[in-house]
């Protein structure tokens, strides 16, 4: 009886199991009982990343510099090009089709995680004892100055945006 299912890396056509084309190659003609599946390598700037019966290869992704993109990994006949963003920018999606400027953490917030090409800056509020007085994509919350270790006293309390102000101790006469 003719087959109704085929092995892995095969496909059923005309009551026959034909070999799929390997990654990096496209289908030119189905197999017959006299000749194997005819496959051809993908052209320059094309790829296919699976065992397939595609008659056309996919175009490599274009990393458009106008969108802040650059090539992270050049595509091959078996893999797509991987784009990433220029320094200071990050991808807007997992597919990295465009970039946006890294977010800065406002005063009162510090950088919890520095941005990468694929993820934005993560900010966190400065907890008690810490402050940030700048808008930055790199600066963490800094601890308040310890007046005691400088043999000084707090003259003005710190906030999440300002450091404490130290001053000399009042001397009792």
């Amino acid at each position: 009886e003719p087959p109704t299912a085929c092995r892995e890396k095969q496909y059923l056509i005309n009551s026959q199991c034909c070999s799929l084309c390997q990654p990096g190659q496209k289908l030119v003609s189905d197999c017959t009982e006299f000749t194997e599946t005819e496959c051809l390598p993908c052209g320059e700037s094309e790829f296919l990343d699976t065992w397939n019966r595609e008659t056309h290869c996919h175009q490599h992704k274009y990393c458009d510099p106008n969108l802040g993109l650059r090539v992270q990994q050049k595509g091959t006949s078996e893999t797509d090009t991987i784009c990433t963003c220029e320094e200071g920018w990050h991808c807007t999606s997992e597919a990295c089709e465009s970039c946006v400027l890294h977010r800065s953490c406002s005063p009162g917030f510090g950088v919890k995680q520095i941005a990468t090409g694929v993820s934005d800056t993560i900010c966190e509020p400065c907890p008690v004892g810490f402050f940030s007085n700048v808008s930055s994509a790199f600066e963490k919350c800094h601890p308040w100055t310890s007046c005691e270790t400088k043999d000084l006293v707090v003259q003005q309390a710190g906030t999440n945006k300002t450091d404490v102000v130290c001053g000399p101790q009042d001397r009792l006469r």
Partner: antibody, heavy 117, light 107 residues
Amino acid sequence: EVQLLESGGGLVQPGGSLRLSCAASGFTFSSYAMSWVREAPGKGLEWVSGIGSYGGGTYYADSVKGRFTISRDNSKNTLYLQMNSLRAEDTAVYYCARYVNFGMDYWGQGTLVTVSS
Amino acid sequence: DIQMTQSPSSLSASVGDRVTITCRASQSISSYLNWYQRKPGKAPKLLIYAASSLQSGVPSRFSGSGSGTDFTLTISSLQPEDFATYYCQQYGRNPPTFGQGTKLEIK
């Protein structure tokens, strides 16, 4: 035992026709693709035509396309090759062969076709 | 059509010799190649399929190798019954095509 027996060869004039037969026995004929291969005097082997098993698709070498027709009668376990518009260059011994996994594992003894005036 | 070129066209060797016949395809055919043995007055016999797989019942002194465009048939130790004509045949593209044959003769 697998056996393939060709018949129908002979002398024919250019432009004439001939029908070759191949009687198969010893295996389930309908389950196998079959083909015709020829060998011209002093030349090598040339694949002429093939016919699939279940789908029954037919395939031809460019040199015979449009002139030769392959067919099969599974009820009679017989393979045929209808040859029309014969030319001198078709002179050869014609073999029928059984196909398995893209190879011809059993062949007949051949029948001679001579095209001459 | 794919052209198959065998070399040499003829070859003289002695019993016990190791013999290699080569077959070159005009374009890549992966490993889609068969080898046949042909003796005068007899039907061809399938020796090797898929470039390197030994057909059932064929002695192990026969072996095949290669992929892409270059293939070889090796007989490790020639026996008297091995003197014959050998053909390669591709099945990577329609139509299947044969090499012109290599005639192996007794030296």
